[in-house]
């Protein structure tokens, strides 16, 4: 057990050009307060992923207004540092998120107004008991200085707080091989007890023998690297055996979310949708308030009116559930045009357009004609993000380029025989029609239904269609 | 000294059920794996898997899943292996073996207990 | 699984000259090799651990070698004592697997 502890040194405008605008002003003064969010491993996970190290939410800062005409400053910061405490062994490599949250206090209707102005995240390794690591970081303009440490808790000692401390058996020394407990140096470090081989990196111990692996590490004694390329099975959950994800029973079988959270498959294990007043993976924390930092991917919490409801998460766009801990599918809604495909990206949707479309939902259809040329005196024909040519008579093909046969489509009606013609076809109807296709039939007395042939031209005769 | 004392020779029917069992004495029974080996002429040996008897922890070979059970009673400092819907393939010598405190990999065995399935 | 292939399964040969048997794992196992001594009558005996760090009274003329996938059992200067079957046994990944065993005959 123990604690990761953070400590803002300052928030303000980044190097270079393009400097923010102070987010107070005289008309709406605000106070600044932090977020940090802390998950084991280095993997990459998604921003909506549970806080499976913990979470906390600073104290607000002092009320600042903006100087008329001054550059932003560094704002003013809440005292104090973050501190999120952990129960298990510190897996010394974590990744964490660090929101600067804003908090308006104008003349609001129903109270302040919040927003986030600054999200930063990283991932990085970090051994217990060491020093402070200083670290930078920049979100648009802004730029977060910050250390961060994490130190175990008595009896706790090492670099992942699993090594245990005893007060000395006598009062001059530690026994052989056993070293003081700093700081606490009337107490001596506890014989190692773990399996035999459990590796020092990767692996570590809380009962007498045993080697359990820190994330990312599998076999006897945490030798070996978890690996999913030889699995044969996507589903979970990950096994000690294989360190592969290896098949089973399903992940949600016999329902590991308590309090009456509800039970949803992912790629990776499971997810519980907890009700109000719990969270956690399982929703077996409770008793939950704002200080907890319940609220994930930047939900604000708000103090519930009443004891059953300790606390309200304001979900910002694109997250919902009692914790703020689920994405929306905004992609569902198909906002992308002109079959356009949606993605969501977490900050933002990005749609990427067919050949021919643009704009940030494909709503813009290109001009399909610029720089396109039809030959043989064919026109352009805008449409469906492709050019088309209408060609002159005679020719064919995507740019006209082709010298069509006129008689390929067969144009001469009621078994009309078809004859390519320097200037384009002739149909020689069949008895009883007439007209330059055949379409028309002849009328038993001689007269046409329609206009009479041309001059010079009985029916039957082939008809030139020009 | 370090010893593990295993139960004698077994003979049981097709289908039945059987409990051997291994007996550690000498250090603190708690703290080390239990190992358990199959032996067959022709196949060498065989890792069935493994207990920590201090927090019934438990590894097994996937081929021994549904076949073989262990347990572990601190207070008689004993553990214990149960097969299950005995064949004639599950006749064979079973050893119990202990990983070192300080040793990565198996101390000291047990002398081995001799199961045989015939109906 | 990791496989060990073990050789040679016989091996016949007379006191005072050197032996070796050879394991090779399917995959590396880094040095998280063991050797063990079968004898009749008498319980498994551990020679060798972490692929080549000698166990405590085990005589000096067991040696082992090797790491990765390719690993080596020397016994220099055979002794009446030695002939037995020999495993080596891989305890980097679950399951822990064994070699098929060699069998040192008296020439």
């Known amino acids: 057990a123990g604690v990761f502890e953070l400590q803002i040194h300052s928030f303000g405008p980044g190097p270079g050009p393009g400097a923010p605008r102070s987010p107070c002003s005289a008309r709406l003064p605000c106070r600044l307060f932090f977020r940090v969010c802390l998950k084991p491993g280095l993997s990459e996970e998604a921003a909506e992923s549970p806080c499976a190290l913990g979470a906390a939410l600073s104290a607000r800062g002092p009320v600042y207004t903006e100087q008329p005409g001054a550059p932003a400053p560094d704002l003013p910061l809440p005292d104090g540092l973050l501190q999120v405490p952990f129960r298990d062994a510190w897996p010394g490599t974590f990744s964490f998120i660090i929101e600067t949250w804003r908090e308006e206090l104008g003349d609001q209707i129903g109270g302040p107004a919040w927003s986030l102005l600054a999200r930063v995240a990283g991932r990085r390794r970090l051994a217990a008991g060491g020093p402070w690591a200083r670290d930078i970081q920049r979100a648009g303009a802004w730029e977060l200085r910050f250390s961060y440490r994490a130190r175990c808790e008595p009896p706790a000692v090492g670099t992942a707080c699993t090594r245990l401390c005893r007060p000395r058996s006598a009062p001059s020394r530690c026994g052989p091989g056993l070293r003081p407990c700093a700081p606490l140096e009337d107490e001596c470090e506890a014989p190692l007890v773990c399996r035999a081989g459990c590796s020092p990196e990767h692996g570590f111990c809380e009962q007498p023998g045993e080697c359990r692996c820190l994330e990312g590490w599998t076999g006897p004694l945490c030798t070996v690297p978890v690996s999913t390329s030889s699995c044969l099975s996507p589903r979970g959950p990950s096994s000690a055996t294989t360190g592969c994800l290896v098949p089973g029973p399903g992940p949600c079988d016999g329902n590991p979310c308590a309090n009456g959270g509800s039970c949803s498959e992912t790629p990776r294990s499971f997810e519980c949708t907890c009700p109000r007043g719990f969270y956690g993976l399982r929703c077996e924390v409770s008793g939950v308030t704002c200080a907890d930092g319940p609220c994930f991917n930047g939900g604000l919490c708000v103090g519930g009116a009443d004891p059953d409801s300790a606390y309200i998460c304001h979900c910002p766009p694109g997250f919902q559930g009692s914790n703020c801990e689920k994405r929306v599918d905004r992609c569902s809604l198909q906002p992308c045009r002109n079959g356009g495909l949606c993605l969501d990206l977490g900050h933002a949707l990005r749609c990427r357009c067919r050949a021919g479309f643009a704009g940030p939902r494909c709503e813009h259809d290109l001009d399909d004609c610029a720089g396109r040329a039809c030959a043989n005196g064919g026109t352009c024909v805008e449409g469906g993000g492709a050019h088309r040519c209408s060609c002159a008579l005679g020719f064919g093909g995507r740019d006209c380029r082709e010298r069509a046969d006129p008689c390929a489509a067969r144009p001469c009606a009621h078994g009309g025989r078809c004859y390519a013609h320097f200037s384009g076809l002739v149909c020689a109807c069949a008895p009883g029609y007439m007209g330059a296709r055949c379409e028309f039939p002849v009328h038993p007395d001689g007269a046409s239904a329609l206009p009479a042939a041309p001059p010079g031209l009985r029916p039957g005769d082939p008809q030139r269609y020009l | 000294q370090v010893q593990l004392q295993q139960s004698g020779t077994e003979l049981m029917k097709p289908g039945a059920s059987v409990k051997l069992s291994c007996k550690a004495t000498g250090y603190t029974f708690t703290g080390n794996w239990i190992e358990w080996v199959k032996q067959r002429p022709g196949h060498g040996l065989e890792w069935i898997g493994e207990i920590l008897p201090g927090t019934g922890s438990t590894q097994y070979n996937e081929k021994f899943k549904g076949k073989a059970t262990f347990t572990a009673d601190p207070s008689s400092n004993t553990a214990y292996m149960q097969l299950s819907s005995l064949t004639t393939e599950d006749s064979a010598i079973y050893y119990c073996a202990r990983w070192g405190s300080t040793v990565v990999a198996y101390d000291y065995w047990g002398q081995g207990t001799t199961l045989t399935v015939s109906s | 699984d990791v496989q060990i292939t073990q050789s040679p399964s016989y091996l016949a040969a007379s006191p005072g000259e050197t032996i070796t048997i050879n394991c090779r794992a399917s995959?590396?196992?880094?040095?998280?090799l063991a050797w063990y001594q079968e004898k009749p009558g008498k319980t498994n005996k551990l020679l060798i651990y972490?692929?080549?760090t000698l166990h405590s009274g085990i005589p000096s003329r067991f040696s082992g070698s090797g790491s990765g996938t390719d690993f080596t059992l020397t016994i220099s200067s055979l002794e009446p004592e030695d002939f037995a079957i020999y495993y080596c046994q891989q305890h980097n990944e679950y399951p822990l697997t064994f070699g098929g065993g060699t069998k040192l005959e008296l020439k």
């Open positions: 995959k590396s196992i880094s040095k998280y």
């Open positions: 972490s692929g080549s």
